[in-house]
């Protein structure tokens, strides 16, 4: 057991210790998306590469069918970047034509699905109006934060429009999580 | 040795333990860049402050000549933000003049150089079209993710145009990594 | 004490160990902001939800009056996202009217207050010119990095204009920190 002479007064001396290299971790990278059916009011989920190139899963963190599966309860840092690219959305022309003054937008959501709750929980959202003039456009949305997850929870990344996702490079669009 | 009575069933009881305060860590902050020669098809690398102000390196994580040097194999969280600023890129004027419909852009790449591979590996990329109208512009690109690195690997941050990097404040442009 | 036969040669064998679940951590989420008095040259600070929904504080990390209170010295990863939304800032019209060519902007600053320094320290800044055409706009600014903090330090998130912050959803605007 840890020598108490080294324990700060606030330390829970009997708390279980763990080797850091043993913690569940994953970094997933983008693949070309195959069109999938999704509910009208729900953004489609991306699927991912989990073992080639920079991608990996380890220590019982598994990837299956668009989901990262949480193998152990605890606090996780979860992150994702999605790079979008598209043709110009000419907002000024839209406005002049008398159509609604609502911009086009791009959105990324990291979602948790849990057995104990009927609805998915949106953990993180990055949403941006896209009102470019004059050219094709491209830009990333990055998200990352810490959440308390339960064993058996599933994580996915949803996007507003799968056809705008840049799937060309593993460093542009990715998704990861690790137990703290 | 840790008492097994406290070990969760999935714990590798004999894995080496480590004090968190002993792990390699670095947070580097921007400095004014001196123009350096770089290959035509390779983005130039930024150099960094490593000990003044908010910047630090510790526990054998060293900085030298634009590179963070990885002293120990393991999974690292790596992050960077680069704030860019520039004069207007009038995409609509460019387009009217009949020039190609390719927007100007800003790009940040976190790159790994490793002994075991002849080419640098792009770990993370943030790239954004810049097609502003009407004024000077400024904006950050943030990146962060987890990667498995080997002892002796070197990390750098490359940008598409060093002259657009905002080097005025240590909180605007930075680069860091820490062993998980 | 840890068995030395498992200790890598660089490990400080007598360094104190700590259970990860015992470390100070917090994830705070946005709430509707009440206008507060602030000094003319200082951006207003956001206040936060600390216990409902996705928000939590644990292991002596406390939230009070806009501040996260650091209970223990060490290296922390600190992050925030603020989603802004507003009506169009017609920069081109501003320019035509002969007014200064300074764009509107949105800024997020994560600030440290410490009793060993009379001024707040800006740890992280994300700042972006906003020069949209044709519509309402919305966009996030994300920040995250590692800093060495002292027991008793206080962290807050300041923004350039509190009225532009999207407070509608806990996944859009948030603030967190955890001891590494």
């Amino acid at each position: 057991l840890k020598g108490q002479e080294f324990a700060p007064s606030h330390q829970q001396v009997y708390a279980p210790l763990r080797a850091d290299g043993d913690k569940p971790r994953a970094h997933l990278t983008v693949v070309r998306q195959t069109p999938t059916q999704h509910f009208k009011n729900q953004f489609p989920a991306l699927h991912w590469e989990h073992e080639l190139g920079l991608a990996f899963t380890k220590n019982r963190m598994n990837y299956t069918n668009k989901f990262l599966l949480i193998p152990e309860s605890g606090d996780y840092f979860i992150y994702s970047q999605v790079t979008f690219r598209g043709m110009t959305s000419e907002c000024s022309e839209i406005r002049q034509a008398g159509r609604p003054n609502k911009p086009d937008s791009i959105t990324v959501v990291i979602t948790k699905v849990t057995d104990s709750y009927p609805e998915p929980t949106q953990l993180l959202m990055g949403t941006k109006s896209v009102c470019e003039v004059g050219s094709n456009w491209f830009q990333p949305i990055y998200l990352g934060a810490m959440f308390s997850l339960q064993e058996g929870d599933k994580l996915m990344v949803n996007v507003s429009d799968i056809s705008l996702v840049d799937y060309t490079k593993e460093d542009k669009t990715f998704f990861g999580a690790f137990l703290l | 040795l840790k008492g097994q009575e406290f070990a969760p069933s999935h714990q590798q009881v004999y894995a080496p333990l480590r004090a968190d305060g002993d792990k390699p860590r670095a947070h580097l902050t921007v400095v004014r860049q001196t123009p350096t020669q770089h290959f035509k098809n390779q983005f130039p690398a930024l150099h960094w402050e490593h000990e003044l102000g908010l910047a630090f390196t510790k526990n054998r994580m060293n900085y030298t000549n634009k590179f963070l040097l990885i002293p120990e194999s393991g999974d690292y969280f790596i992050y960077s933000q680069v704030t860019f600023r520039g004069m207007t890129s009038e995409c609509s004027e460019i387009r009217q003049a009949g020039r190609p419909n390719k927007p100007d852009s800003i790009t940040v790449v976190i790159t790994k150089v490793t002994d075991s591979y002849p080419e640098p590996t792009q770990l993370l990329m943030g790239t954004k079209s810049v097609c502003e109208v009407g004024s000077n512009w400024f904006q950050p690109i943030y990146l962060g993710a987890m990667f498995s690195l080997q002892e002796g690997d070197k990390l750098m941050v490359n940008v598409s145009d060093i002259s657009l990097v905002d080097y005025t404040k240590e909180d605007k442009t930075f680069f860091g990594a820490f062993l998980l | 004490l840890k068995g030395q036969e498992f200790a890598p040669s660089h490990q400080q064998v007598y360094a104190p160990l700590r259970a990860d679940g015992d470390k100070p951590r917090a994830h705070l989420t946005v709430v509707r902001q009440t206008p507060t008095q602030h000094f003319k040259n200082q951006f207003p600070a956001l206040h936060w939800e600390h216990e409902l929904g996705l928000a939590f504080t644990k292991n002596r990390m406390n939230y009070t009056n806009k501040f996260l209170l650091i209970p223990e010295s060490g290296d922390y990863f600190i992050y925030s996202q603020v989603t802004f939304r507003g009506m169009t800032s017609e920069c081109s019209e501003i320019r035509q009217a002969g007014r200064p060519n300074k764009p509107d902007s949105i800024t997020v600053v994560i600030t440290k207050v410490t009793d060993s320094y009379p001024e707040p320290t800006q740890l992280l800044m994300g700042t972006k010119s906003v020069c949209e055409v044709g519509s309402n706009w919305f966009q996030p600014i994300y920040l995250g990095a590692m800093f060495s903090l002292q027991e008793g330090d206080k962290l807050m998130v300041n923004v350039s204009d509190i009225s532009l912050v999207d407070y509608t959803k806990e996944d859009k605007t948030f603030f967190g920190a955890f001891l590494l």
Epitope: - | - | T114, D115, S116, P118, E119
Partner: antibody
Framework: QVQLQESGPGLVRPSQTLSLTCTVS????????MHWVRQRPGRGLEWMGR????????KYNPSLKSRVTITRDTSKNQVSLRLSSVTAADTAVYYC?????????WGQGSLVTVSS | DIQMTQSPSSLSASVGDRVTITCRAS?????MYWYQQKPGKAPKLLIY???NLASGVPSRFSGSGSGTDFTFTISSLQPEDIATYYC?????????FGQGTKVEIK
């Protein structure tokens, strides 16, 4: 504008407890840290301790720790100092000081004499 | 405790002279502060973080140094600068002040 006003009895009997209050205005003291510093006649400055008004956390000068207590009442914008078991050596001007978060600012000081 | 040794304890200089006060810490500190105290008044912060001029302080005051050795300078002494000057470290517990340097006009 910013004000820090120390108040309390100017005379305290030996072995009694010295009590002073600092009332602040013009800023939110929870954005800062509040310190007490004293200056004995013809002597230099001595830091006594500080409180974080946001959390109530305190730090004290170890040489005074057994005798000093600093508290705050944020609803009244007040910070208080108590120094127990005083002797003539505690005769001093006592200053309330704001620091951290906002520029340093000192009260004008309160002279306390310990005498029977 | 971190001991602050300030020198000289007093000095006399003419108007317009350059005045230098030194402060040595018994161990390295990151931040050093310099205060001015006029008779019957509270101290006033002049320099923070070793070299930053506090708001409203004339530019003839400056500070420098790092680690254990710090210097405070008045580039051109003015009559209103007659005061006692203190260094202080604001980090270790307890915070400690130098014993003061009394500056007088010749």
């Amino acid at each position: 504008q910013v004000q820090l006003q120390e108040s309390g009895p100017g005379l305290v009997r030996p072995s009694q407890t010295l009590s002073l209050t600092c009332t602040v205005s013009g800023f939110d003291m929870q954005d800062t840290y509040m310190h007490w510093v004293r200056q004995r006649p013809g002597r230099g400055l001595e830091w006594m301790g500080r409180i974080d008004p946001a959390s109530g956390h305190t730090k004290y000068n170890p040489s005074l720790k057994s005798r000093v207590t600093i508290t705050r009442d944020t609803s009244k914008n007040q910070v208080s100092l108590r120094l127990s078991s005083v002797t003539a050596a505690d005769t001093a001007v006592y200053y309330c000081v704001r620091s951290g978060g906002l520029p340093d600012y000192w009260g004008q000081g309160s002279l306390v004499t310990v005498s029977s | 405790d971190i001991q602050m040794t300030q020198s000289p304890s007093s000095l006399s200089a003419s108007v317009g002279d350059r005045v230098t006060i030194t402060c040595r810490a018994s161990q390295g500190v990151e931040y050093m502060y310099w205060y001015q105290q006029k008779p019957g008044k509270a101290p006033k912060l002049l320099i923070y973080g070793a070299s930053n001029l506090a708001s409203g302080v004339p530019s003839r005051f400056s500070g420098s140094g790092s680690g254990t050795d710090f210097t405070f300078t008045i580039s051109s002494l003015q009559p209103e600068d007659i005061a006692t000057y203190y260094c202080q470290q604001w980090e270790g517990n307890p915070r400690t002040f130098g014993q003061g340097t009394k500056v007088e006009i010749k």
